[in-house]
């Protein structure tokens, strides 16, 4: 079954994808596919590299990793209820039937209505909603509610909490492998 | 020490062809890919294409295509650019650049140049 | 293609002053920019790739920033060697694609 990802209307989604180049120099050809993997290829093809670099996209999809060093994870921008669904990244390893395939469900929520903006609610925009780790476990996107009207001290409480948390460093390693 | 030493300038008439070289020494040539960038005089650079030694696999940007060929000689570890069908246009000097996959494809060497003049 | 627009076109900075140069491209490029120096009858050099890595042997008065969209190159206190044009140039997806250049002269 797929892992689930999750982003807000109006945000940007990440699906993350690794593998370990075998070779510095030849790049193992990368296709991300709107749709479950098929048995070759991926269909509906909205992004795909080749042996060196980026070769097709199409608009707001893009590789925003170190996509020469394996990072392949997916970036779709300002994603709307339409990009909801399953997402393909294919790993395409020469030879027959070596191809690594996963399945990336993609949901979107709407996006939160807010009350009228007042001068706290400024706050928010140094702390935006989504928060983005690269990291190697299911949950690389959390979401955060839309923040209430809250005092200074509450203010100096989350702003410590957000800096020591995970969600704040980026844990992905340059040996990440195929996951 | 990485060295891309490019032949000399040419001078060459309309609707000629030319064929220039860039002889790799210092690294191990097939591990790297070799590109081509067009400089027009007092102009920015453009990228002609590329190939990659080790399978002689090539890319081209589109406005290049016919107009360059790239080849490579693993043994001399020298790489090639071929120019048809000359016009003033193509008046420029070309750079062969090695594209470092630790550079992430930037390009961390690069030859002296060969100036071309197509003239009649 | 990818577009790449740099500003200014030409700056004249005094000695010793930061030195700001700007980038963007057309569409995002995550991290795959590299800036390039070159200077009058010279080849250009590496001085950034990946967008904010000085390249070995680079003094450490430059130093790169940004992604996707755009991109800085920033001299921290400007030296007489430091005349020259500059270009960034993204690697994302071929075409590769340079900057028009920016020169910079000496105030």
């Known amino acids: 079954s797929e892992v689930e990802y999750r982003a807000e209307v109006g945000q940007n989604a990440y699906l993350p994808c690794f593998y370990t180049p075998a070779a510095p120099g030849n790049l193992v050809p990368v296709c991300w596919g709107k749709g479950a993997c098929p048995v070759f290829e991926c269909g509906n093809v909205v992004l795909r590299t080749d042996e060196r670099d980026v070769n097709y996209w199409t608009s707001r999809y893009w590789l925003n990793g170190d996509f020469r060093k394996g990072d392949v994870s997916l970036t779709i921008e300002n994603v709307t209820l339409a990009d909801s669904g399953i997402y393909c990244c294919r790993i395409q390893i020469p030879g027959i039937m070596n191809d690594e395939k996963f399945n990336l469900k993609l949901v979107i929520k709407p996006a939160k209505v807010t009350p009228a903006p007042t001068r706290q609610r400024d706050f928010t925009a140094a702390f935006p909603r989504m928060l983005t780790t690269r990291g190697h476990g299911p949950a690389e996107t959390q979401t955060l509610g839309s923040l209430p009207d809250i005092n200074l001290t509450q203010i100096s409480t989350l702003a410590n909490e957000l800096r020591d948390s995970r969600l704040a460093n980026d844990l992905r390693d340059s040996g990440a492998t195929i996951r | 020490q990485v060295q891309l030493q490019q032949s000399g300038p040419e001078l060459v008439k309309p609707g000629d062809s030319v064929k220039m070289s860039c002889k790799a020494s210092?690294?191990?040539?097939?591990?790297?890919?070799m590109d081509w960038v067009k400089q027009s005089h007092g102009k920015s650079l453009e990228w002609i294409g590329y190939?990659?030694?080790?399978?002689?696999?090539?890319s081209y940007n589109q406005k290049f295509k016919g107009k360059a060929t790239l080849t490579v000689d693993k043994s001399s570890s020298t790489a090639y650019m071929e120019l048809h069908s000359l016009t003033s246009e193509d008046s420029a000097v070309y750079y062969c650049?090695?594209?470092?996959?630790?550079?992430?494809?930037?390009?961390?060497?690069w030859g002296q140049g060969t100036t071309l003049t197509v003239s009649s | 293609d990818i577009v790449m627009t740099q500003s200014p076109d030409s700056l004249a900075v005094s000695l010793g002053e930061r030195v700001t140069i700007n980038c963007k491209a057309s569409q995002s490029v995550g991290n795959n920019v590299a800036w390039y120096q070159q200077k009058p009858g010279q080849s250009p050099k590496l001085l950034i790739y990946y967008a904010s890595n000085r390249y070995t042997g680079v003094p450490d008065r430059f130093s790169g920033s940004g992604s996707g969209t755009d991109f800085t190159l920033t001299i921290s206190s400007l030296q007489a060697e430091d005349v020259a044009v500059y270009y960034c140039q993204q690697h994302y997806s071929s075409p590769y694609t340079f900057g028009q250049g920016t020169k910079l002269e000496i105030k």
């Open positions: 210092g690294y191990t040539f097939t591990d790297y890919y």
């Open positions: 650049a090695r594209g470092g996959y630790y550079s992430y494809y930037s390009y961390d060497y």
């Open positions: 190939i990659y030694p080790n399978n002689g696999g090539t």
